[in-house]
């Protein structure tokens, strides 16, 4: 069904990283416009991106209200210039998205090594606690605030002079590792949520090596 010359959206896809969440769909509109609605299982549909010619809609503001809820979105198609028109079923043509649970499905963004500090044969590596768009009491929460102990970081480190990698894990944002005195090391970190079944790992952070600006070396 649907209004003449109006086609339903398809390939509705959630794109979400660190809770920044955008719904994308096809096709590029020809003589039609779209409106998006989003709801939890309560069925209280909220309209967003009214009568847009875009094929994406930023739904971050809605999903951050409760990242543990499961959401469904639907994209309505209307003829351009005649948005009151409805299909033969007495309602505009629409398509539903897959369900989306931000806490379980948002991609983990690429982490950043904030600093590393060597004290003798120990190196303290600190991962930047990235801010998300999730708010509590008018304050933006960090990734650690949101995920708590569900989030761990894996550190990959190796001597600059060799390729053999070692790993360490932490459920905070800091690592304290043993190194050989007089050797320079390189570091990369990865965010991981072990309890997840999908999107468990982030991409690796950019590599940082000792002897560069990020680090501090103190001989004891």
């Amino acid at each position: 069904s649907g209004t003449t010359n109006t086609v339903a959206a398809y390939n509705l896809t959630w794109k979400s990283t660190n809770f920044k969440t955008i719904l994308e769909w096809e096709p590029k509109p020809v003589n039609q416009v779209y409106t998006v609605q989003i709801s939890t299982k309560s069925g209280d549909w909220k309209s967003k991106c009214f009568y847009t010619t875009d094929t994406e809609c930023d739904l971050t503001d809605e999903i951050v209200k409760d990242v543990k809820q499961t959401y469904l979105a639907r994209v309505f198609s209307y003829p351009a210039g005649n948005v009151e028109s409805t299909g033969s079923a007495g309602e505009p043509l629409y398509e539903n998205s897959p369900e989306f649970t931000p806490y379980l499905e948002t991609n983990l963004g690429q982490p950043t090594i904030q600093s590393f500090e060597q004290v003798g044969t120990k190196v303290n590596v600190t991962v930047e606690d990235e801010r998300t768009l999730v708010r509590r009491n008018n304050t933006f929460l960090s990734l650690r605030d949101v995920f708590g102990k569900d989030l761990i970081y894996t550190l990959y480190y190796w001597k600059s002079s060799s390729s053999g990698k070692k790993t360490a894990k932490t459920n905070t944002n800091e690592f304290l590792i043993d190194v050989d005195k007089g050797e320079n090391y390189c570091f990369s970190v990865q965010a991981v949520i072990p309890s997840r079944t999908v999107n468990r790992k982030s991409t690796d952070s950019p590599v940082e090596c000792m002897g560069q600006e990020k680090g501090e070396f103190r001989e004891i």
Partner: antibody, heavy 118, light 106 residues
Framework: EVQLLESGGGLVQPGGSLRLSCAAS????????MAWVRQAPGKGLEWVSA????????YYADSVKGRFTISRDNSKNTLYLQMNSLRAEDTAVYYC???????????WGKGTTVTVSS | DIQMTQSPSTLSASVGDRVTITCRAS??????LAWYQQKPGKAPKLLIY???SLESGVPSRFSGSGSGTEFTLTISSLQPDDFATYYC????????FGGGTKVEIK
């Protein structure tokens, strides 16, 4: 355990009114849309009405529009169906159901019987 | 409104049989279809939603498939507890049920 318990059914004359209730327990009532579905004797299932979690959105089958009103009291975890101008063809078992997004019914009550007869 | 047509209306089968019930929609409903089981004097029970997603606690012998206008509920090996009436339901546009398929003992 998630449970739904309907009440308020009975025998009523054509043109009369009846109010069905559905008491919910075992889940966060306000977080789910709810629906009423009926089944006439020996017949199949017919969707009657649905309501969003906040009560702000309501939907009706054409066969009951203007006669039936769905509502909910989230403070009492209770769903209602006010049925006016009842007809013989409204005779059925009425089920209340938990309905994620208002789309499908994942938990059903045992049903309450409404008989419209003179 | 979208019409849902189930076939057959009655199906005779034996324990252990593979049983297939078909549901056709009058227009495309993508994958927005649910299947229910109902026994006499009891409330319906959700088996499948979104055409192929098995509801929690439902035995794996039940499976759903299809998209667009044609859908299938399959019981891989019929058990004594499976003799019942089965309904499909679309939720693409409002809600409509199929007329039901009664699975009876051969």
């Amino acid at each position: 355990e998630v449970q739904l318990l309907e009440s308020g059914g009975g025998l009523v004359q054509p043109g009369g009114s009846l109010r069905l209730s559905c008491a919910a327990s075992g889940f966060t009532f306000s977080s789910y849309a709810m629906a009423w579905v009926r089944q006439a004797p020996g017949k199949g299932l017919e969707w009657v009405s649905a309501i969003s979690g906040s009560g702000g959105l309501t939907y009706y089958a054409d066969s009951v529009k203007g006669r039936f009103t769905i509502s909910r009291d989230n403070s009492k975890n209770t769903l209602y169906l006010q049925m006016n101008s009842l007809r013989a063809e409204d005779t059925a078992v009425y089920y209340c159901a938990k309905a994620p997004y208002g789309y499908y019914m994942d938990v059903w009550g045992k049903g309450t019987t409404v008989t419209v007869s003179s | 409104d979208i019409q849902m047509t189930q076939s057959p209306s009655t199906l005779s089968a034996s324990v252990g049989d593979r049983v297939t019930i078909t549901c056709r929609a009058s227009q495309s409903i993508s994958s927005w279809l649910a299947w229910y089981q109902q026994k006499p004097g009891k409330a319906p029970k959700l088996l499948i939603y979104k055409a192929s997603s098995l509801e929690s606690g439902v035995p794996s012998r039940f499976s759903g498939s299809g998209s667009g206008t044609e859908f299938t509920l399959t019981i891989s090996s019929l058990q004594p507890d499976d003799f019942a009436t089965y309904y499909c339901q679309q939720y693409k546009s409002y809600i409509t049920f199929g007329g039901g398929t009664k699975v009876e003992i051969k």
